[in-house]
Each structure stands twice: as C-alpha cells, then as structure tokens.
C-alpha cells in the first residue's frame, strides 16, 4: 500500500539525520553542490542539485527517497530558477540545512 | 534541574474560558529543539493530548478541541499558556505541561513533567 | 487518529514475578513507541522512549521491545515501589495517543 506522506518525510528526515551523525570522512569527498532556495519545491530542488553528485553512496537513498517525492523526472545538469545563483556548498552542509528545513515542515505538518 | 509548574484557577464555571500557565525551571523555550505539551487527565481515567509548541513557535493542536484551544508563550517568562475556551463539565481534569526534545528524529516523548494542577468546571 | 490498545488493563502479581504489559497500535507506528509510569496522586514519568531507550535514572528491571504495531513493557522482577499504572503513548503522528493504561498491583 503507499506510504502515507507523513511517513515518508519523517523516512527522508530519519536518513538525513542518519548521514548527519554517521558522518565521519568529508561526506562525498567534499563534493560541492547548488545551493537551494529552501522555501518552494523543495524537493526538486534538492533532487536537482544532489543528482549531479555520482558515486557517493552515502546519498544514494537520499536521492531515491526524493525522486519519490518530486513530480516530474529530474535529470543531471537540470537546474531549475530554486537554485541559488552562482552559490556552491558541500554536501554535507546542504545535507544539513535540508535536514534542518524539513524537520520544520514536518512539524508544521506539511507533509506533500 | 529541569521542572515544570502549572498554574490555573481550580474553579471555572461552564461556558467560561480557562487559562493554564506552564512556568519553565532548568531549560528554555528559546533553546533550538525544545517543545511543550499539554496533558489532561480526568478524574480516574486515562490521558489525553491536548496542543504542543516548539521552540520556534510552531503549534499543534488535537484536532477534536482545536476550535477551543490556543497554546503560546512568553519566551521572556519563560512560560507557555494553554487557553481553552467555553468550558463544561467534562473539561474537569488535572491538566499537566511536559517538556518535549526533539534532537534528530523527530518524535514526541515527554521526558519531564509538571505536578499538575486540577481543574474543575462547575456553576 | 492512531488508537492504542492495552492489555491487560490492570494485574496483580507477586514481588519477583517477571511482568509484561502490551500495546497495540492500530496502524504502524514505526518504533515511536513510549511508556510512563504513573504513581497514584503523581504525575506520569517517562519509562521508555523510540520504543526501549531509557532515560537516565531509570532502574534496569524495566525494558521494551516490539516493532510495527505490535510492543511490549517487561518488568523482569517486579518490586513494590512498581505499583503504579502504566501507559503507552505513540510518537509517531499526530495527535499523540495514549493507551487506557495498565494498573500494576502486588499479590
């Protein structure tokens, strides 16, 4: 049966918090990333900018879990007008400000 | 140490509003992660939820007495207030605030309570 | 809303007995399972939190365990100063719910 929305969030939160503290190299090497605007599409947006990482597996199920979330098929170098112009973080400081992000919806009860 | 203390007016008469104060010992609302609850519990019977708010003032409510309740605080009192209005008898409760942490997961245990305090409704 | 289910609602049993408490959700509530115990005139306090974590202070004859929903509370040598009724809660959606509780009296 599908997962219901809440659930699934608190799945994506429960594995960002999960990279957060298993964290002990320079997550995907130190890779860097798109920053996101955080305050629509969120989820796209994040897919977005984390797709062009390959070859770290400590996001992969990330990445998964917001394919699940984002309505449309979302492809490496696809950036949409979310992303913050001409600013680059690392994964590992997206991860958290994402986590951070959607520990708020969650609580507010936005679940979709 | 952390403790929380209710507050109330022991007697309200129906159709009034009730107003309960949580006064916060040992930790603050301002502090990122923190949370508090609202409990009641009548007279021999089990517990209820009732609102919560977080520290970033995020609020939750049960949504069979959302129409009636409103939870906020006072971050400078340090203390969180819990309205519920046009009270009836069977709001007659010991109505009790408890502290929420909510660091990493979010899920919601109460690891420390107030003492209570009882309120009854009554003309 | 998630309803929880308690058996038994109260026991008695002698000091010693292993005792065990269960609760049951009406749907998965993914391991945010918590119990309190809560002492006659007191206010409740928190036993076990995300199903068997402890808080500190809290003696080792207690523990938890399940998954799903499906849970347990187990007193493994049940003392006098235990007689109290217990109570699970789901953390997991909201609006948090609590079981009807369990009374625990000695024999």
């Known amino acids: 049966s599908p997962v219901p929305p809440s659930t699934a969030l608190k799945e994506l939160i429960e594995e960002l918090v999960n990279i957060t503290q298993n964290q002990k190299a320079p997550l995907c090497n130190g890779s860097m990333v798109w920053s996101i605007n955080l305050t629509a599409g969120v989820y796209c947006a994040a897919l977005e900018s984390l797709i062009n990482v390959s070859g770290c597996s400590a996001i992969e199920k990330t990445q998964r879990m917001l394919n699940g979330f984002c309505p449309h098929k979302v492809s490496a170098g696809q950036f949409s007008s979310l992303r913050v112009r001409d600013t680059k973080i690392e994964v590992a400081q997206f991860v958290k400000d994402l986590l951070v992000h959607l520990k708020k919806l969650f609580r507010e009860g936005q679940f979709n | 140490e952390v403790t929380l203390r209710e507050s109330g007016p022991g007697l309200v008469k129906p159709t009034q509003t009730l107003t309960l104060t949580c006064t916060l010992y040992?930790?603050?609302?301002?502090?990122?992660?923190?949370?508090v609850d609202w409990i009641r519990q009548p007279p021999g019977k089990g517990l209820e939820w009732l609102a919560h708010i977080w520290w970033d003032d995020v609020k939750r409510y049960n949504p069979a007495l959302k129409s009636r309740l409103t939870i906020s605080k006072d971050t400078s009192k340090n203390q969180v207030v819990l309205k519920l209005t046009s009270v009836d008898p069977v709001d007659t409760a010991t109505y009790y605030c408890a502290r929420t942490v909510s660091s990493g997961y979010i899920y919601y245990a109460m690891d420390y309570w107030g003492q209570g305090t009882l309120v009854t409704v009554s003309s | 809303d998630i309803q929880m289910t308690q058996s038994p609602s109260s026991l008695s049993a002698s000091v010693g007995d292993r005792v065990t408490i269960s609760c049951r959700a009406s749907q998965d509530i993914r391991n945010y399972l918590n119990w309190y115990q809560q002492k006659p005139g007191k206010a409740p306090k928190l036993l076990i939190f995300y199903t068997s974590m402890k808080p500190r202070g809290v003696p080792s004859r207690f523990s938890g365990s399940g998954s799903g929903t499906d849970y347990t509370l187990t007193i493994s040598s049940l003392q006098p100063e235990d007689i109290a009724t217990y109570y699970c809660q789901q953390g997991n959606t909201l609006p948090l719910t609590f079981g009807g509780g369990t009374k625990v009296e000695i024999k």
């Open positions: 040992g930790f603050s609302l301002s502090t990122s992660d923190m949370g």
